[in-house]
């Protein structure tokens, strides 16, 4: 999967969409690496 | 509301060096990474890097084998590209520009700066 | 690096008609694509991101598909507002890297 800073950033922005905003804090793009998806 | 606002124009000899910043306020600074592209008159745009603010790593455009450099200061929510051995090629706009999540999806840019490099 | 290449790079068109430019990727970058719009002394501003996804805000006459290497972006009903040169770029690989442009002009 593409782990560029701009694709990691929509994938969380997908993610937390999905979990209705409900995903902690501290899970921001710059926090999360590609692995965590 | 998310604003980036960067430093005025520059005007560079041949040779010199060139540090535009990029001052971002409206959300949390360190949570999304920091892009710099550039474009040069009648040009399309050209990527140059980008930082994660929250750590330093940064990923660079090797088209400019070494001479960018982009840092950020944390404290006082700014980022910064500094460009190296400026040539007339150079002359261009360069743009911060960052894809937020909260408070707004949307991906925000800075007005530009216009660096002109003439001898 | 990935290349982007955009046609046709200008075309004529009237208020009301149905605009569509395209972007072929020199290798397979998914849906990886964003789609920009700037104008004259402006930054650019984005429509659309992975391909398909307009970002709030953004009119729902512009809209984009495509993935692997062909893309495509669509302004169903082009408005006096919508005269602007439209950029797509690439994310999926470092360098990130942008089509040449596609100058729309009043005909």
């Known amino acids: 999967a593409c782990d560029t800073a701009t694709c990691v950033t929509h994938r969380l922005a997908g993610l937390l969409s999905r979990s209705g905003g409900v995903v902690k804090n501290n899970f921001v793009p710059t926090n999360v690496g590609s692995k965590a998806f | 509301e998310v604003q980036l606002v960067q430093s005025g124009a520059e005007v560079k000899k041949p040779g010199a060096s060139v540090k535009v910043s990029c001052k971002a306020s409206g959300y949390t600074f360190t949570d999304y990474y920091m892009n710099w592209v550039r474009q040069a008159p009648g040009q399309r745009l050209e990527w140059m890097g980008d930082i994660n603010p929250n750590s330093g790593g940064t990923n660079y455009n090797q088209k400019f084998k070494g001479r960018v450099t982009i840092t950020v200061d944390k404290s006082a929510s700014t980022a910064y590209m500094e460009l190296s051995s400026l040539r007339s090629e150079d002359t261009a706009v360069y743009y911060c520009a960052s894809i937020i999540i909260v408070p707004n999806y949307f991906d925000y840019w800075g007005q530009g700066t216009t660096v002109t490099v003439s001898s | 690096d990935i290349q982007m290449t955009q046609s046709p790079s200008s075309l004529s068109a009237s208020v009301g008609d149905r605009v569509t430019i395209t972007c072929k990727a020199s290798?397979?970058?998914?849906?990886?694509v964003a789609w920009f719009q700037q104008k004259p002394g402006k930054a650019p501003k984005s429509l659309i991101y992975?391909?398909?996804y307009r970002y709030s805000g953004v009119p729902s006459r512009f809209s984009g598909s495509g993935s692997g290497t062909d893309f495509t972006l669509t302004i169903s009903s082009l408005q006096p507002e919508d005269f602007a040169t439209y950029y797509c770029q690439q994310y999926n690989n470092y360098p990130y890297t942008f089509g040449g442009g596609t100058k729309v002009e009043i005909k």
């Open positions: 992975s391909a398909s």
């Open positions: 290798q397979n970058v998914d849906t990886n």
